[in-house]
């Protein structure tokens, strides 16, 4: 008897079942149709909260979360200050745009990483123009 499944009729990784009187394809999540030929929209009806965008892949939806949010559906508020990103005693605050560092006197930069020289100049490398000490990270 010919193994009709050897022809690999099931698409997209579907499991072939030879029932004798018929072939049946058991489709992986995210696929449908007699031969699993239809790629379902993983993101259909699935909302990512707080400005996150849904990304299809492997039959399961995934949320790409906006800055400041995390979790499966972007419903959890991420803690941008967890890793203590503000150097030299800077105080870290969660901010709508991510985080902001209040720098201790004598330091500046988005992460308080640059010392301010006594003459008022800073040891900033070529930094983006317009970034002031204590400005929130975009």
């Amino acid at each position: 008897r010919v193994d009709r499944c050897s022809l690999q009729p099931c698409r997209n990784g579907g499991l072939c079942l030879d029932l004798g009187h018929a072939l049946r394809c058991r489709c992986r999540a995210g696929f449908a149709g007699p031969r699993c030929e239809h790629d379902l929209d993983d993101c259909a009806g699935r909302a990512c909260a707080n400005g996150g965008t849904c990304v299809e892949g492997g039959g399961a939806h995934r949320c790409s979360c906006a800055l400041g949010f995390g979790g499966r559906d972007c419903r959890e508020r991420a803690d941008p200050c967890a890793a203590r990103p503000c150097a030299h005693g800077g105080r870290c605050y969660a901010h709508f745009s991510g985080l902001v560092c209040a720098c201790a006197p004598g330091y500046m930069g988005a992460r308080c990483e640059f010392p301010v020289h006594p003459d008022g100049a800073s040891a900033l490398p070529a930094a983006p123009p317009g970034l002031r000490p204590g400005d929130p990270q975009r």
Epitope: R77, D79, P80, C81, A82, A83, R84, G89, R91, C92, Y93, A94, H95, V100, A102, A104, P105, G134, D135
Partner: antibody, heavy 123, light 111 residues
């Protein structure tokens, strides 16, 4: 509606200990800046005690006079405690919980306060 | 660091103007990290002014903050009976760590 409520106040003997709790509703600490404690002796002014980061870093700041006897900690995403030891009559006060937020490059802006809880130290 | 408020108490008639001074023994953080609070008996303080001169949300424009460095002023114009309260200035500093101090308070009496 964002709210803070303090609890745990009451009468305590000199040299005794007490733990105050601040509970938030309507927001979680991780999405705010720092949570702080401020006290006010009867008929007197305000006195800052300590702050703790609302996030998971647990960074703390203390008034010099409070170091050693007072300890601030975050017990959940909505509760902060203040442990007080070796209490004296001078610690008799209303203890307020307040939220410190960053606004316009300034910090220690207490834009949300609880109603306070009274601690009386007396024998 | 000490914040000295003067005068106390201060009184004025409804519709009048009062000015409260706050003198810091050293410059506050960034020269402008000073806030003003209003407190009524039996209530917690309420943030009025932050960054020395910025009005907090919901606060009427009759309240005006000014100053920088070590000298700050709160002016309340067009006084209303509801303005009767104690007002506190609060400065923020850094010296091997962050800390904050309050002024002693100024009681405003509205006649």
């Amino acid at each position: 509606q964002e709210q803070l409520v303090e609890s745990g106040g009451g009468l305590v003997q000199p040299e005794g200990s007490l733990t105050l709790t601040c509970t938030a509703s309507g927001f979680s600490f991780s999405s705010s800046g720092y949570m702080c404690w401020v006290r006010q002796a009867p008929g007197k002014g305000l006195e800052w005690i300590a702050c703790i980061s609302g996030g998971s870093s647990g960074d703390t700041d203390y008034a010099n006079w409070a170091k050693g006897r007072f300890s601030i900690s975050k017990t959940s995403s909505t509760t902060v405690t203040l442990q007080m030891t070796s209490l004296t009559v001078a610690d008799t006060a209303t203890y307020f919980c307040a939220r410190d937020v960053y606004i316009d490059s300034t910090i220690f802006n207490f834009n949300l306060w609880g109603p306070g809880t009274l601690v009386t130290v007396s024998s | 660091q000490v914040l000295t408020q003067t005068p106390s108490p201060v009184s004025a008639a409804v519709g009048g103007t009062v000015t409260i001074s706050c003198q810091a023994s050293q410059s506050v953080y960034n020269n402008n990290n000073l806030a003003w609070y209003q407190q009524k008996p039996g209530q917690p303080p309420k943030l009025l002014i932050y960054a020395a001169s910025s009005l907090a949300s919901g606060v009427p424009s009759r309240f005006k903050g000014s100053g920088a460095g070590t000298q700050f002023t709160l002016t309340i114009s067009d006084l209303e009976c509801d303005d009767a309260a104690t007002y506190y200035c609060q400065g923020t500093y850094y010296s091997s760590g962050w800390y904050s101090t309050f002024g002693g308070g100024t009681e405003v009496v509205v006649k």
